[in-house]
Interface confidence: low
Amino acid sequence: AITEAREEAKPYPLFPGPFPGSLQTDHTPLLSLPHASGYQPALMFSPTQPGRPHTGNVAIPQVTSVESKPLPPLAFKHTVGHIILSEHKGVKFNCSISVPNIYQDTTISWWKDGKELLGAHHAITQFYPDDEVTAIIASFSITSVQRSDNGSYICKMKINNEEIVSDPIYIEVQGLPHFTKQPESMNVTRNTAFNLTCQAVGPPEPVNIFWVQNSSRVNEQPEKSPSVLTVPGLTEMAVFSCEAHNDKGLTVSKGVQINIKAIPSPPTEVSIRNSTAHSILISWVPGFDGYSPFRNCSIQVKEADPLSNGSVMIFNTSALPHLYQIKQLQALANYSIGVSCMNEIGWSAVSPWILASTTEGAPSVAPLNVTVFLNESSDNVDIRWMKPPTKQQDGELVGYRISHVWQSAGISKELLEEVGQNGSRARISVQVHNATCTVRIAAVTRGGVGPFSDPVKIFIPAHGWVDYAPSSTPAPGNADPVLII
């Protein structure tokens, strides 16, 4: 059933004629102008109180009637001043005015909190004309009020460029508390105090707050909103929420999880991305971060050779990008590799160790005792050397690379020769006479080319010279290679 709260509306004594409240049952409005489709309200407040007209904002008509009587001031009738209702209820309120018929083109507009209400609001204006006056009732209905409908509503009427304003009608929508600030999930240090905040508003006020931890109330006595809960410290994860109470009932906030920061879990899936003679590129999948962002990671490397001294090399790196190139490793060696990462609480355990190997390396030593001499009869340069002492990890010797540079007036050219690993001598053709030949030799393994020997120079005379002797690598300590002719 629709209940209407009505007050009797009486016309001004000066304006005789029918008016709402004293209308005949067969008296219907001559004209009804709906602004938008109307809805049947659950509650209706009628327009007027009996008696005097409203005296706030009035317009004094300057026109006189045929009998030259001055017309009274125009004003909206008093109406209900304050409506309190619950959220989602319907409400209808109105304002009314009686206007002499000499005025044409009267319009009534609704305003809320200083802004005109346009468009799809449920406003209807009804006109009840009589011989001398027209009673105008402007109704405004809201089918299901929200908090946003709270505010001050007024009617405005323009007549002959004059503006008449009604008394305000205050709408107060009451409902369950509404949260403006809810507790946030946090990651906290064990046994360290932290704060949670909860704030809710009405109307109706006041709003009282109860805190709930793991389904149990924390405070026996409610606190007025806003409330800050100081938790002295936790030793394990907990879920907090807050209850907001007012006269309309109770609203419960979302439950937030408070996690206890812990050391991270160890990384998983450490894998080898790439391996060279002296470096290994690894990647890993980080473990659970312990509710605290990773700060950095430590790569631990130890030689897997049972004869090694067991020392561990440690390389520190940033937590991202879960990738690290371990450098300065020995060639052709086996290593065990583990990864540990840290957050603000501490270091994780080491990941499962993985085995990785470096590839063969390039030789680390140049061939020794390089000797160069001219075999004039065959127009060749003979080169001899001693095989360098190779470490096991340098890999298997596959040969030698010989660089010979020929320099004479205005000419310089370099040639490279590759020779097999078996010999320790080579013969190269004379390229230019009356020139200096500079020879350097490097050993080669599958791991790459080693360092070149110190240069050895020999002068190749013009045809017909007889005196010659070999050139060789100088003894240690000499500053320059010796040229022997």
């Epitope: 946030e184 962002p293 937590a319 991202l320 990008p321």
Partner: antibody, heavy 118, light 108 residues
């Protein structure tokens, strides 16, 4: 140091790729971000790229930009430039990040100017 | 969307005075403290001043300080010098899948 290159005048709709080269540190151990600044305006973060995870973009930049990296460079492709993309583009080293969340941007390039005009 | 609001677009101070710049974050920055401050002078790239809300970047004078946690942060410059006239930006890291970093609008 960080150095951007590739900025120039382009017409709307013409794809453009900016390149960032670094020295003094290795791209294998740092995430990198791109930030832009329109003339007279503030800074806008475009996204972050790391070795281990896919690039993370600002919502407004997704689809409009592509960030990629090689072992020596970081690239930013403006897929279909509009006049609104006129800006100085900075390549920036990310000192530390987790799950694509930058902690701080600690080393900035001088920027390269991109002008989009018909 | 992640939003960092620097309410003052410009502030002024006398040489030797103190100036404060505020920055409000919505939502809270990652770990409550992943908030950094940058200084940018005309024609130059930005320079990192403060990170983790209050930690001084290397080479930055101790007259610069930062404070705050969660959603409210402040940069303070004491004994301010002429050559510190610049635009100052706050920036924060956030834990969502995208928009994991954002800058404030800047304060000149």
């Amino acid at each position: 140091s960080v150095e951007e290159s590739g900025g120039r005048l382009v017409t709307p709709g013409t794809p453009l790729t900016l390149t960032c080269t670094v020295s003094g540190f290795s791209l294998s151990t740092y995430s990198m971000s791109w930030v832009r600044q329109a003339p007279g305006k503030g800074l806008e973060w475009l996204g972050i790229v790391s070795v281990a995870i896919d690039p993370v973009y600002a919502t407004w930049a997704r689809g409009r930009f592509t960030i990629s990296r090689t072992s020596t460079t970081v690239n930013l492709k403006i897929t279909s430039p509009t006049t609104e993309d006129t800006a100085t583009y900075f390549c920036v080293r990310v000192a530390f990040s987790t799950n694509g969340i930058p902690h701080r941007l600690d080393l900035w390039g001088q920027g390269t100017l991109v002008t989009v005009s018909s | 969307a992640q939003v960092l609001t620097q309410t003052a677009s410009s502030v002024s101070a006398a040489v030797g005075g103190t100036v404060t710049i505020s920055c409000q974050s919505s939502p809270s920055v990652y770990n409550h403290n992943w908030l950094s401050w940058y200084q940018q002078k005309p024609g130059q790239p930005p320079k990192l001043l403060i990170y983790e809300a209050s930690k001084l970047a290397s080479g930055v004078p101790s007259r610069f300080s930062g404070s705050g946690s969660g959603t409210q942060f402040t940069l303070t410059i004491s004994d301010v010098q002429c050559d510190e006239a610049a635009t100052y930006y706050c920036a924060g890291g956030f834990s969502s899948g995208s928009d994991s970093f954002a800058f404030g609008g800047g304060t000149e």
